[in-house]
Interface confidence: low
């Protein structure tokens, strides 16, 4: 006597107050894999989600986040306020980067510039809210009879003041 | 080859609890099947009494339902009955048995169980 | 409930005869197209043994003598030609509706 719930293919499930018949999916469900009791209740793509894959009845609907949000989690289980480059999201809002910090994402929270001087580097580009510090060459790089290099212009952008 | 043993006391006394204990051999109980308990009364008229499914839901013959519970021991390969408030009419031999389609394929040889003060 | 009555209650064949065991039940028991009706031949000191399943699939092992027959609340265990083996008591149970219910059991004698 074979159990007949191991034949159940995805899409169906073992109803076992039928003596075990694959019985398919209801709808607004599914089953990903063969030989279950049960189908699962599709997830709905609600509020700040929105609908990225149908539920069919062999695989769950797949949900990203309307614009101006982005996901976070396991299968987008959560949708995150998206911010400006320079800020980070804190529980009152974006607020911009502190001083000596960056964000270059619409995402995570600021992080320190980088400190050259740990490699005994020296600054070639200044931070900004948006940008991280760029290290040049190593003073002793800069040394007579060490090959030349000179540092381009500290770059600018548009609209922001030095920090 | 899949083999059942069931065990427990041989007298129970009226308004105490029937504890019987099937063991499984050969074959995981979490694997697949339905995991049944019958008994026959004196006089060989069957009765089934509920089965525990692999995945651990529960079926039970609502004329026992206030009084019947099924469960199992994963760790053990074990599954279990309680029968609560016994009488002499629950005086039977108790069977546990594997099953699926309805229809049960491997059975425990049996234990008798006399209700009786 | 559904209520399967057998009959006969016990009946006497000879070795290489036909033994034909009748189980009606009180409603039918089936559900899209299959008869969930099942035969287990019993003997004594020994737990019921499963011959038939869903009207007429012959378990594994069983000889091929035993056969099922059957839809809706008429079903039939045939046994041909009977061996002397074959003496034991034969229970026919549904599956369809809760609760599962036995028949109250054929004893077949060898003559």
């Known amino acids: 006597l074979q159990d007949p719930c191991s034949n159940c293919p995805a899409g169906t499930f073992c109803d076992n107050n039928r003596n075990q018949i694959c019985s398919p999916c209801p709808p607004n469900s599914f089953s990903s894999a063969g030989g279950q009791r049960t189908c699962d209740i599709c997830r709905q793509c609600k509020g700040v989600f929105r609908t990225r894959k149908e539920c069919s009845s062999t695989s769950n609907a797949e949900c990203d986040c309307t614009p101006g949000f982005h996901c976070l989690g396991a299968g987008c289980s959560m949708c995150e306020q998206d911010c400006k480059q320079g800020q980070e999201l804190t529980k009152k809002g974006c607020k911009d980067c502190c001083f000596g910090t960056f964000n270059d994402q619409k995402r995570g929270i600021c992080r320190p510039w980088t400190n050259c001087s740990l490699d005994g580097k020296s600054v070639l580009v200044n931070g900004t809210k948006e940008r991280d510090v760029v290290c040049g060459p190593s003073p002793a790089d800069l040394s007579p009879g060490a090959s030349s290099v000179t540092p381009p212009a500290p770059a600018r952008e548009p609209g922001h003041s030095p920090q | 080859d899949v083999q059942l043993q069931e065990s427990g006391p041989d007298l129970v006394k009226p308004s105490q609890s029937l504890s019987l204990t099937c063991t499984v051999t050969?074959?995981?109980?979490?694997?697949?099947?339905?995991w049944h308990w019958i008994r026959q009364f004196p006089g060989n008229k069957l009765e089934w009494m509920g089965y525990?499914?692999?995945?651990?839901?529960?079926n039970y013959n609502p004329s026992l339902k206030s009084r019947i519970s099924i469960t199992r021991d994963t760790s053990k390969n074990q599954f279990f009955l309680q029968l609560n408030s016994v009488t002499t009419e629950d005086t039977a031999t108790y069977y546990c048995?594997?099953?699926?389609?309805?229809?049960?394929?491997?059975w425990g040889q049996g234990t008798s169980v006399t209700v009786s003060s | 409930d559904i209520v399967l009555t057998q009959s006969p209650a016990s009946l006497a064949v000879s070795p290489g005869q036909r033994a034909t065991i009748s189980c009606k039940a009180s409603?039918?028991?089936?559900?899209?197209?299959?008869?969930?009706m099942n035969w287990y031949q019993q003997k004594p000191g020994q737990p019921p043994k499963l011959l038939i399943y869903?009207?007429?699939n012959v378990e594994s092992g069983i000889p091929a003598r035993f056969s099922g027959s059957g839809s809706g609340t008429d079903f039939t265990l045939n046994i041909h030609p009977v061996e002397e083996e074959d003496a034991a008591t034969y229970y026919c149970?549904?599956?369809?509706?809760?609760?599962?219910?036995f028949g109250g059991g054929t004893k077949l004698e060898i003559k």
């Open positions: 048995a594997r099953g699926a389609l309805g229809a049960m394929d491997y």
């Open positions: 050969g074959y995981s109980i979490t694997s697949g099947y339905n």
């Open positions: 525990i499914h692999y995945s651990g839901s529960t």
């Open positions: 409603q039918s028991v089936d559900y899209d197209g299959d008869s969930y």
């Open positions: 869903v009207a007429s």
């Open positions: 149970q549904q599956s369809n509706e809760d609760p599962w219910t």
